[in-house]
């Protein structure tokens, strides 16, 4: 089977972490988050060609029916596998106090 | 804010569990699954529009910096939230056995 | 619920080195965005921050006192260190550890106080 | 280094009655300033984030106010639990920096 974490379509084509530099308002928190002011976020972007970074069986069964099936199927998706936490310093009704993300930036990525 | 499971493309246009009829031989499996001969197969299909069954946090970071880079950002992608067992039958090099599979049908769907 | 606890030698002399330990729980410093800071306060003065430790290891030092100042983490025992070398009765003060988002200072600890005397 | 400055060490209030406390940063700041009250034998707690965001639990008679280098921390309907030292700090830069203080009295 070819190496699942060689992209066949040439380097960096293939899905991986990318970081993406925002601000509050590209990120639509103006509103509600004080701190930080920028974001360096982390996701997961690129193609998921077949065998590579397979999630699970469901994402092989995927890839073979579309295939078979491309306009009914779509191929798998580049989706973190996990994710990093990260503290927001956000207004709330009661003041300004610190909230813990877990599901905010991508650690590492797999195609589902 | 616009209704999380409504979709605004139009109905079925959406995230949502679709069922697929395949064979052992459109899956690939033909060669290790006795059985079942054929499989319905539940899989994640659809377009993920702004807030339509957003999973998490990174989502909406996703949604937000895809409408803002669309060339660099892609929207978010309909996957398995969550996933329902299945067993197959299959040959092994001491004969054939049942095993049971935790991620190969899709039970329900949401945006990432 | 979040809570730090400093802890330190008490007394010191003159020329030696104070080591300080920040013990904390309720909290992660492998989080984006978390850090600890130290602050001192000599008795009946004002606060002086001393050292902050990012989660990803970024350390920042008081540049008056950085030549002798070093801040460390070991994140899986949820623990800060501070040293200070060269201890002289200036230094004399109560020891804060606050723990920080981003530049958010909300929980200190209870202090640890540092006698330097001959 | 930035220097804040809390021109008055000591100030006297009566319960009830208002008071406020004025920090002055050595150079802009913007809104990167926060308070602190500190009660006699306690570590300092945090009353005001940004210049004029109450940390969550903190009683809305207390009000930040300002920007660039005039900061104001006021305090209204001033009870006796208030009898503290109040400090600002600015985290615009590093080194961060602390007012050297105000301690309220109640009279």
């Known amino acids: 089977a070819r190496n699942g974490d060689r992209c066949p379509l040439g380097p960096g084509r293939c899905c991986r972490l990318h970081t993406v530099h925002a601000s509050l308002e590209d990120l639509g928190w103006a509103d509600w988050v004080l701190s930080p002011r920028e974001v360096q976020v982390t996701m997961c972007i690129g193609a998921c060609p077949s065998q590579f970074r397979e999630a699970n069986m469901h994402a092989q069964i995927k890839m073979n029916l579309h295939r078979l099936k491309p306009d009914t199927v779509p191929a798998p998706c580049c989706v973190p596998a996990s994710y990093n936490p990260m503290v927001l310093i956000q207004k709330t009704d009661t003041g300004v106090s610190l909230q813990t993300y877990d599901d905010l930036l991508a650690k590492d990525c797999h195609c589902v | 804010a616009r209704n999380g499971d409504r979709c605004p493309l139009g109905p079925g246009r959406c995230c949502r569990l679709h069922t697929v009829h395949a064979s052992l031989e459109d899956l690939g499996w033909a060669d290790w699954v006795l059985s079942p001969r054929e499989v319905q197969v539940t899989m994640c299909i659809g377009a993920c529009p702004s807030q339509f069954r957003e999973a998490n946090m990174h989502a909406q970071i996703k949604m937000n910096l895809h409408r803002l880079k669309p060339d660099t950002v892609p929207a978010p992608c309909c996957v398995p939230a969550s996933y329902n067992p299945m067993v197959l039958i299959q040959k092994t090099d001491t004969g054939v056995s049942l095993q049971t599979y935790d991620d190969l049908l899709a039970k329900d769907c949401h945006c990432v | 619920q979040v809570t730090l606890k400093e802890s330190g030698p008490g007394i010191l002399q003159p020329s030696q080195t104070l080591s300080l330990t920040c013990s904390f729980s309720?909290?992660?410093?492998?989080?984006?965005?978390?850090?600890v800071s130290w602050i001192r306060q000599p008795s009946g003065k004002g606060l002086e921050w001393l050292a902050h430790?990012?989660?990803?290891?970024?350390?920042r030092y008081n540049p008056s006192l950085k030549s002798r100042l070093t801040i460390s983490k070991d994140t899986s025992s949820n623990r800060v260190f501070l040293k200070i070398t060269s201890v002289d009765t200036a230094d004399t003060a109560t020891y804060y550890c606050?723990?920080?988002?981003?530049?958010?200072?909300?929980?200190w600890g209870q202090g640890t106080t540092l006698t330097v005397s001959s | 280094d930035i220097v804040m400055t809390q021109s008055q060490k000591f100030m006297s209030t009566s319960v009830g009655d208002r008071v406020s406390v004025t920090c002055k940063a050595s150079?802009?700041?913007?809104?990167?300033v926060a308070w602190y009250q500190q009660k006699p034998g306690q570590s300092p707690k945090g009353l005001i984030y940004?210049?004029?965001y109450r940390y969550s639990g903190v009683p809305d008679r207390f009000t930040g106010s300002g920007s660039g280098t005039d900061f104001t921390l006021t305090i209204n309907n001033v009870q006796s639990e208030d009898l503290a030292e109040y400090f600002c700090?600015?985290?615009?830069?590093?080194?961060?920096?602390f007012g050297g203080g105000t301690k309220l009295e109640i009279k």
């Open positions: 430790i990012y989660w990803d290891d970024d350390k």
């Open positions: 940004s210049a004029s």
């Open positions: 309720g909290f992660s410093l492998s989080t984006s965005g978390m850090g």
């Open positions: 150079q802009n700041v913007g809104t990167n």
């Open positions: 606050a723990r920080t988002g981003w530049d958010f200072f909300d929980y």
């Open positions: 700090q600015q985290y615009n830069s590093y080194p961060y920096t």
